[in-house]
């Protein structure tokens, strides 16, 4: 339940456009089962490319590009009747105003890859 | 390249730790290929939860739950010797301070299961 | 290194109940999901049910389900399987698994006879 159940939702129209952010991240140490273990294992392999823009917080942002078109069966050969998508999120980062060396930001949506996973195409024969 | 090439990184320790953010957010239709495009289709199904908080910004975030712990195969069967496992990320969001309707925030790190993907484990006999 | 200790097998007559527990020691940390498998000689090893330790999601084999009812105990790390009107076709060795995601670790097996 909220702590302040009369406070305006962050989300509503008439809620201040521009608000104070500490950027002491709670949290910081979130015990993650890394996607890395899998990235390997998975029947829909990635490689993770480093997305770096010192414009941005966070400054560095792991993308996930599947290694293959197809999914790796059993035996470690690639299935092309299967695909290897990624999974992708929209999160929300900072961005540097662009006046010169400001403590400002605005908050922006990007779309990110996290990972892939293997999924059947649907198939359709053209007349 | 960086537009203020002089100035400090958001993540440098000299940086202030509380800044102004525009919560008008940029790229807000970011054109997303929906990963819920393939939560049926995958190998790895997965459905997704609600998680609400009023207190957090944003306040709706949605939370993938893998359906099965195998993989599901060619035939729609599940196969127990693959694993369905959650593809996790840590993204960044706001968390209101706890004083009565304040502007402000502090960032706190959340951990996310976005969708699932199959993987392959080794295989350990216990003596 | 992970152990796993497995009891709880016997022989029972058509219809009699029998529960199988194991527990696991060591490095288990980071459990994915706990259950059983069972193999009756001159076939594959079968999924029996599984319990994930995230949130206790459960799953079963169709030929056991409404019959046996897999359990765990958190702070213990251990599963229990309670099987119940069981059929002399329920005859195999249940082998405990421990899953870690992209490690898998099997017990020795326990053997279970149900005659009829």
């Known amino acids: 339940s909220p702590q302040n159940p009369g406070c305006p939702n962050a989300e509503d129209k008439n809620f201040p456009r521009t608000v104070m952010v500490n950027l002491n991240i709670r949290n910081r140490n979130t015990n993650s089962k890394r996607a890395s273990d899998y990235y390997n294992r998975s029947s829909s392999p990635w490689n993770l490319h480093r997305n770096e823009d010192p414009e941005r917080y966070p400054s560095v942002i792991w993308e996930a590009k599947c290694r293959h078109l197809g999914c790796v069966d059993a035996d470690g050969n690639v299935d092309y009747h299967m695909n290897s998508v990624p999974i992708q999120q929209e999160i929300l980062v900072l961005r540097r105003e662009p006046r010169h060396c400001t403590n400002s930001f605005r908050l922006e949506k990007m779309l990110v890859s996290v990972g892939c996973t293997c999924v059947t195409p649907i198939v359709r024969h053209v007349a | 390249s960086p537009q203020n090439p002089g100035c400090p990184n958001a993540e440098d320790k000299n940086f202030p730790r509380t800044v102004m953010v525009n919560l008008n957010i940029r790229n807000r239709n970011t054109n997303s290929k929906r990963a819920s495009d393939y939560y049926n289709r995958s190998s790895s199904p997965w459905n997704l939860h609600r998680n609400e908080d009023p207190e957090r910004y944003p306040s709706v975030i949605w939370e993938a739950k893998c359906r099965h712990l195998g993989c599901v195969d060619a035939d729609g069967n599940v196969d127990y010797h693959m694993n369905s496992v959650p593809i996790q990320q840590e993204i960044l969001v706001l968390r209101r301070e706890p004083r009565h309707c304040t502007n402000s925030f502090r960032l706190e790190k959340m951990l996310v299961s976005v969708g699932c993907t199959c993987v392959t484990p080794i295989v350990r006999h216990v003596a | 290194e992970v152990q796993l200790v497995e009891s709880g097998g016997g022989s029972v007559q058509a219809g009699d109940s029998l529960r199988l527990s194991c527990a696991a020691s060591?490095?288990?940390?980071?459990?994915?999901?706990f259950g059983w498998f069972r193999q009756t000689p001159g076939k594959e090893r079968e999924f029996v049910a599984g319990?994930?330790?995230?949130?206790?999601?459960?799953e079963y084999a169709n030929s056991v389900k409404g019959r046996f009812t897999i359990s765990r105990d958190n702070a213990k790390n251990t599963v229990d399987l309670q099987m119940d009107s069981l059929k002399p076709e329920d005859t195999a060795v249940y082998y405990c698994?421990?899953?870690?995601?992209?490690?898998?670790?099997w017990g020795q097996g326990t053997q279970v006879t149900v005659s009829s």
């Open positions: 698994v421990l899953d870690l995601s992209t490690v898998r670790y």
């Open positions: 060591g490095r288990a940390n980071s459990i994915n999901w």
């Open positions: 319990i994930r330790w995230s949130d206790a999601y459960t």
